[in-house]
Interface confidence: medium
């Protein structure tokens, strides 16, 4: 009888563990969906506002190829920076290539000098992997040079010619990016 009760208890425990795993997966999925939704809204907002504007980029944004960039005027923590970009139909900068990195660092030198600028890169708390905001991994040449010693969440930033990492709660300037409007000519 005791063995039977013990077996049932173990089965229930196993079931509970499975449910917890499912809940965790669902929570992750929900978070991912919320982020995707934000991206869609940002993209739609960008498309609509651009339709009323003949120039490829809004005032005070810098254009390079198909992208428009905005360099912030005040400091923010990483999460607030991302919110600010999303509000403007853009996202924190996602660096796709060395060419883009060179353009950004060259432009920053001209505009502001050697400060810290948040980009859309953060470290996954569980796996320690670096991820851009769209969930993709940076190319090997674009991984932050130094691993932050912070016990808190770690995010990526650009300084001079380097991609570095820091506690996401520190204050930095930030860079937003959105698609440039294609000329209809």
């Amino acid at each position: 009888k005791l063995l039977q009760v013990s077996t049932i208890a173990m089965q229930q425990q196993e079931k509970l563990i499975q449910q917890e795993r499912a809940l965790l997966n669902f929570t992750e999925w929900k978070r991912s969906c919320a982020l995707q939704m934000k991206y869609c809204q940002a993209f739609m907002q960008n498309s609509l506002s651009s339709a009323h504007n003949s120039s490829p980029c809004p005032n005070n944004w810098i254009q390079n190829r198909e992208s428009c960039y905005y360099v912030s005027e005040i400091w923010s923590i990483w999460h607030t920076s991302q919110e600010n970009c999303l509000k403007e139909g853009s996202t924190l900068l996602q660096i796709e290539s060395k060419e883009e990195m060179d353009f950004i660092t060259g432009s920053l030198r001209k505009i502001k000098g050697s400060y810290d600028y948040w980009v859309g890169l953060s470290q996954d708390g569980h796996s320690g992997r670096w991820l851009w905001q769209d969930g993709s991994s940076p190319s090997p040449g674009l991984l932050p040079a130094e691993r932050s010693q912070s016990a808190n969440q770690v995010c990526g930033y650009v300084k001079s010619n380097s991609l570095l990492s820091s506690n996401c709660s520190t204050w930095k300037y930030f860079i937003c990016e959105k698609y440039a409007l294609r000329s209809s000519v």
């Epitope: 005032n59 944004w61 905005y70 912030s72 005027e73 005040i74 923010s76 607030t80 600010n84 937003c176």
Partner: nanobody, 117 residues
Amino acid sequence: QVQLVESGGESVQAGGSLRLSCAASGRTISNYDMAWSRQAPGKEREFVARISGSGDRTDYADSVKGRFTISRDNAKNTVYLQMNSLKPEDTAIYNCQTQIFGSPNFSGQGTQVTVSS
């Protein structure tokens, strides 16, 4: 076009208090982050405090934490910086700034704070 006008800066003794105000005109600033920064002669600009549009989130530089308080009155389109336990190293020109996309850097002319020992 947004105009920002700072006021309230003056000379005080170390340990004293001041309240700086930043009045905005030309546009409602209630949706925008606001910040106070300062620059002492020969030094780089330093951001000392930031407040979110709704006023629910504030951040402070380590050098002023526990002494300075940023607040805003969106009905009056004004942001404040309450500065207590002032130190000589707080001497600087204080500017208020706002983050408005698609616009130049909106920053006032500044107000001078001098703290003597």
